[in-house]
């Protein structure tokens, strides 16, 4: 699997999951969460050559096209697989309130 | 959507459907496919500005993020959303076979 | 260079599974389909069946059916047939082979053979 | 299944001579579904002929292939010492693929 496991301890320029930490306030300009200041979002990047962790049969049959049609466009790319929710703390007025936002974490990748 | 309906008929150079057809002997090699000779197989290619057709919470953040970093090279991608089966005959020697071959044809796609 | 290349010898129990890999170069595993071939010692040529890889369609010799599974790794261009149930007729070399192109077709690629003893 | 059936079993010939090893089916493969291999001890089978007729890529023009239906032969024009090895026929008309028992062909 193309996660952290695998893919941080590897030096790897093909579809991978990549570390990234986005501050809130800083990166998104939002003021209304309270905790946490910031989270490992990560995301995924990186070349989809032949067959890398192909999703789909069409995924795998584009992959072979481009292979064997290496001047066309039609490739693959590299996306979120495996996605995790985060739990936030944010005031309504001076309540407050814990919300758990869907899919905000990635964990794998594939080329899709 | 970002479908045929839409994307074959607007000049649209974020992410879209895009055509593409795959003759099965000349561009996979593959000569075990009888019928048909090829297929449209589609492709989604295309530029994933902040929020355009986003598909989770953290592409929508991974979006907002770029725009906020545009250095940043952390940016959705554009790939296929609803996929559809094939419809294939093949012989096993003399005998014809059908099979359907699943997610073979891109029908919308999304920035993921 | 186009090769098919297989995992080493075996010794197993009877009752137990063997599972022999075949890693193909890039070409082979795209377009071709790639079938299984049995030599029990000093016998014949026996073709146990035959799996296209990328869209994991096999076809089995009846005679095998139900003790054998073909399948295809795409992340490594590998093909795999796992025979169980092993019984010691079924000591032999095994071969893997990529067909001219059609699911039952002439083989003209072949691997260097894996040896599975089975023996208690 | 369709058998098919070598003959001979052994076939003694010395260098230089012409050699015809024959190949008959349970059933009509028709005209293209036949192949013949070529085994030396020890190594893996070679493809000589397809389609019951057609010279596989590298394979000398003294190895000829014939026939359709239920009848084949493989014929070798003019033996060299690298030819005496076992032959096999194959059918791929029908599933399960059959293969012939083997002929060895042995220096006289």
């Known amino acids: 699997a193309l996660d952290a496991a695998y893919c941080f301890r590897n030096v790897q320029d093909n579809c991978c999951l990549r570390p990234l930490y986005i501050d809130f306030k800083r990166d998104l300009g939002w003021k209304w969460i309270h905790e946490p200041k910031g989270y490992n979002a990560n995301f995924c990047a990186g070349a989809c050559p032949y067959l890398w962790s192909s999703d789909t049969q069409h995924s795998r049959v584009l992959s072979l096209y481009n292979t064997i049609n290496p001047e066309a466009s039609a490739s693959p790319c590299c996306v979120s697989q495996d996605l995790e929710p985060l739990t936030i703390l944010y005031y309504i007025g001076k309540t407050p309130k814990i919300e758990q936002l869907s899919n905000m974490i990635v964990k794998s990748c594939k080329c899709s | 959507a970002l479908d045929a309906a839409y994307c074959f008929r607007n000049v649209q150079d974020n992410c879209c459907l895009r055509p593409l057809y795959i003759d099965f002997k000349r561009d996979l090699g593959w000569k075990w496919i009888h019928e048909p000779k090829g297929y449209n197989a589609n492709f989604c290619a295309g530029a994933c500005p902040y929020l355009w057709s986003s598909d989770t919470q953290h592409s929508r953040v991974l979006s907002l993020y770029n725009t906020i970093n545009p250095e940043a090279s952390a940016s959705p991608c554009c790939v296929s959303q609803d996929l559809e089966p094939l419809t294939i005959l093949y012989y096993i020697g003399k005998t014809p076979k059908i099979e359907q071959l699943s997610n073979m044809i891109v029908k919308s796609c999304k920035c993921s | 260079e186009v090769q098919l290349v297989q995992s080493a010898a075996e010794v197993k129990k009877p009752g137990a599974s063997v599972k022999v890999s075949c890693k193909t170069s890039?070409?082979?595993?795209?377009?071709?389909?790639i079938s299984w071939v049995q030599q029990a010692p000093g016998a014949g040529l026996e073709w146990m069946g035959g799996?296209?890889?990328?869209?994991?369609?096999?076809n089995y010799a009846q005679r095998f059916k139900g003790r054998v599974t073909l399948t295809a790794d795409t992340s490594t261009n590998t093909v795999y047939m796992e025979l169980s149930n092993l019984r010691t007729e079924d000591t032999a070399v095994y071969y893997c082979?990529?067909?001219?192109?059609?699911?039952?077709?002439?083989?003209?690629?072949w691997g260097q053979g894996t040896l599975v003893t089975v023996s208690s | 299944e369709t058998v098919l059936t070598q003959s001979p079993g052994t076939l003694s010939l010395s260098p230089g001579e012409r050699a015809t090893l024959s190949c008959r089916a349970s059933?009509?493969?028709?005209?293209?579904?036949l192949a013949w291999y070529q085994q030396k001890p020890g190594q893996a089978p070679r493809l000589l002929i397809y389609?019951?007729?057609s010279r596989a890529p590298g394979v000398p023009a003294r190895f000829s292939g014939s026939g359709s239906g239920t009848d084949f032969t493989l014929t070798i024009s003019s033996l060299e010492p690298e030819d005496f090895a076992v032959y096999y026929c194959?059918?791929?008309?029908?599933?399960?693929?059959?293969f012939g028992q083997g002929t060895k062909l042995e220096i006289k």
């Open positions: 389609g019951a007729s």
């Open positions: 799996v296209i890889p990328i869209v994991d369609i096999a």
């Open positions: 059933q009509s493969l028709g005209s293209s579904y």
């Open positions: 194959q059918q791929y008309a029908d599933s399960p693929i059959t």
């Open positions: 890039g070409y082979i595993f795209i377009s071709n389909v």
């Open positions: 082979a990529s067909t001219l192109g059609l699911v039952l077709d002439a083989m003209d690629y």
